[in-house]
Amino acid sequence: ALDTNYCFSSTEKNCCVRQLYIDFRKDLGWKWIHEPKGYHANFCLGPCPYIWSLDTQYSKVLALYNQHNPGASAAPCCVPQALEPLPIVYYVGRKPKVEQLSNMIVRSCKCS
Amino acid sequence: ALDTNYCFSSTEKNCCVRQLYIDFRKDLGWKWIHEPKGYHANFCLGPCPYIWSLDTQYSKVLALYNQHNPGASAAPCCVPQALEPLPIVYYVGRKPKVEQLSNMIVRSCKCS
C-alpha cells in the first residue's frame, strides 16, 4: 500500500504519500480554528506508470495508453485513497467546542 | 457537474472530462477484444482551483493551500468521478463471449 509507513521511509519516485504540514493561518488564512495551529495533512505526488497501484480498470487502460503514447496528456493521477479526520477546537462566543473535521489527513494514495 | 454534457459543449479550462478515443490494438496492444475495435474512454484534465468541484474537505484545504502557496507541488488533481462499463465481444476458441468491462468510460470528473 502507498501509505505513510511505506512512503515516508522510502525514496519512492512513483505515486506515494508525501509529508506536508499546513499552518491554518499562514497557509489557509483560517483564524477560526483555535487548536491545533496546524497539522500534517500530507499530499499525493509522483507518476503513475502501468501497474502502479491503479484504482480501476479505467486507470489500467489509461496507464497502458500512456505507455503506448508517451507524449499524451491523458494519464492517471496520484490522488488520496485513505483519509482520516482531524479533531479541532474552535470557539462559539467564549465557549470552546471540539469537533472532528472529516477527510483531512491523507494516509495513502492511489493512481486514478 | 463536470460531465460530458457540460464539458464537451464548453471551452472549460479547469478540470473537466475531455474526449479520448482508444484503439485497443494501436493504443493498448490488446488483440483479444474482437468488438469494438476501440471506444470513447475520455479522460480528465485541467487545473483544480479553490471551489472547483472539490471532492472532500481535504481537496478544499489543498486547493486553498495552493492558492496561498502558488509555487507548491501540492495541489488537487482532476480525476474520474463517474465511470461506466463497456460491453465487449471476445472469443474463447471459436465461441464468441459477451462481457461488460466495468469502469471503462469516464462520464464526469472531480478534483481530488
Epitope: Y21, D23, R25, K26, K31, H34, E35, P36, K37, G38, H40, P87, V89, P96, V98 | -
Partner: antibody, heavy 117, light 103 residues
Framework: EVQLVQSGAEVKKPGASVKVSCKTS????????MNWVRQAPGAGLDWMGQ????????NYNGKFKGRVTLTADTSTSTAYMELSSLRAGDIAVYYC??????????WGQGTLVTVSS | EIVMTQSPASLSLSQGEKVTITCRAS??????LAWYQQRPGQAPKLLIY???NLADGVPSRFSGSGSGTDFSLTISSLEPEDVAVYYC?????????FGQGTK
C-alpha cells in the same frame, strides 16, 4: 538557524512593570505563534500566553488577571512581554518560545526578573 | 483548564536502566502533547512533539507514546547526561498547562 535572544536580567520594585524582549532570527517571525513561559526559582513551568505576530492576535492565561501584555514588532522580528503590578511572587526566569507543530520547539535563553524594594 | 498530572515526582536510577514517566490529562487531548527536558540552569529542550514524534537531534533512546488522556515518555537506556527535570505540556486549548515535572 533559528535563534531567540532575550534581553538581560531586570531588577524592579514592587508595583512597577517590566518589559522583556525576545529578538528572533532564522525563520519567518510573522507566521509563527510566540509563547511566553515563566519559571519561579525551584518551581515548574507556567504558561503565560501567546501572540501571533502576523496580526497581533493573543491568548492569555487567566491566572495573570490582565497583568500581562504581549506585543510584537514585525520590523525587527522582536516579541515583547510586559508584566505590570510586580510583586515578590513574580520573581522568575521568563522564557519566550516559538510554537510549532503542537510544541514549543525553540526557546530563548531566559530572562531573570527580580522584584525587590 | 486542562490539568496535567505527572508521575513520579522524582526517580533515582543507574546508568543503562529503562525509565518511564507518565502524564495524565484531565480530559481528552488527542495527541496534542509535548515532552521537554530541562537541565539545571538551562532552558527547556523539546524531546517529543505530537505525543510520539521525536524532535530533531534527540537521541533515539527517547520515545513517546499514548493518546487521549494517558501518555508516557520512555528512556530505553539511561545515560549520565539524561539527569534533568522532564515536563509534559498539552496543546489542546489555552492555557497550555505543564505537568509538575519529574526529576
Amino acid at each position: 538557524e533559528v535563534q531567540l535572544v532575550q534581553s538581560g536580567a531586570e531588577v524592579k520594585k514592587p508595583g512597577a512593570s517590566v518589559k522583556v524582549s525576545c529578538k528572533t532570527s532564522g525563520y519567518t517571525f510573522i507566521s509563527s505563534w510566540m509563547n511566553w513561559v515563566r519559571q519561579a526559582p525551584g518551581a515548574g513551568l507556567d504558561w503565560m500566553g501567546q501572540i501571533y505576530p502576523g496580526d497581533g492576535d493573543t491568548n492569555y492565561n487567566g491566572k495573570f488577571k490582565g497583568r500581562v501584555t504581549l506585543t510584537a514588532d514585525t520590523s525587527t522580528s522582536t516579541a515583547y512581554m510586559e508584566l505590570s503590578s510586580l510583586r515578590a511572587g513574580d520573581i522568575a526566569v521568563y522564557y519566550c518560545a516559538r510554537h510549532y507543530d503542537g510544541s514549543t520547539d525553540y526557546w530563548g535563553q531566559g530572562t531573570l526578573v527580580t522584584v525587590s524594594s | 483548564e486542562i490539568v496535567m498530572t505527572q508521575s513520579p515526582a522524582s526517580l533515582s536510577l543507574s546508568q543503562g536502566e529503562k525509565v518511564t514517566i507518565t502524564c495524565r490529562a484531565s480530559e481528552n487531548i488527542y495527541s496534542n502533547l509535548a515532552w521537554y527536558q530541562q537541565r539545571p540552569g538551562q532552558a527547556p529542550k523539546l524531546l517529543i512533539y505530537a505525543a510520539t514524534n521525536l524532535a530533531d537531534g534527540v537521541p533515539s533512546r527517547f520515545s513517546g507514546s499514548g493518546s487521549g488522556t494517558d501518555f508516557s515518555l520512555t528512556i530505553s537506556s539511561l545515560e549520565p547526561e539524561d539527569v534533568a527535570v522532564y515536563y509534559c505540556q498539552h496543546f489542546w486549548g489555552t492555557p497550555y498547562t505543564f505537568g509538575q515535572g519529574t526529576k
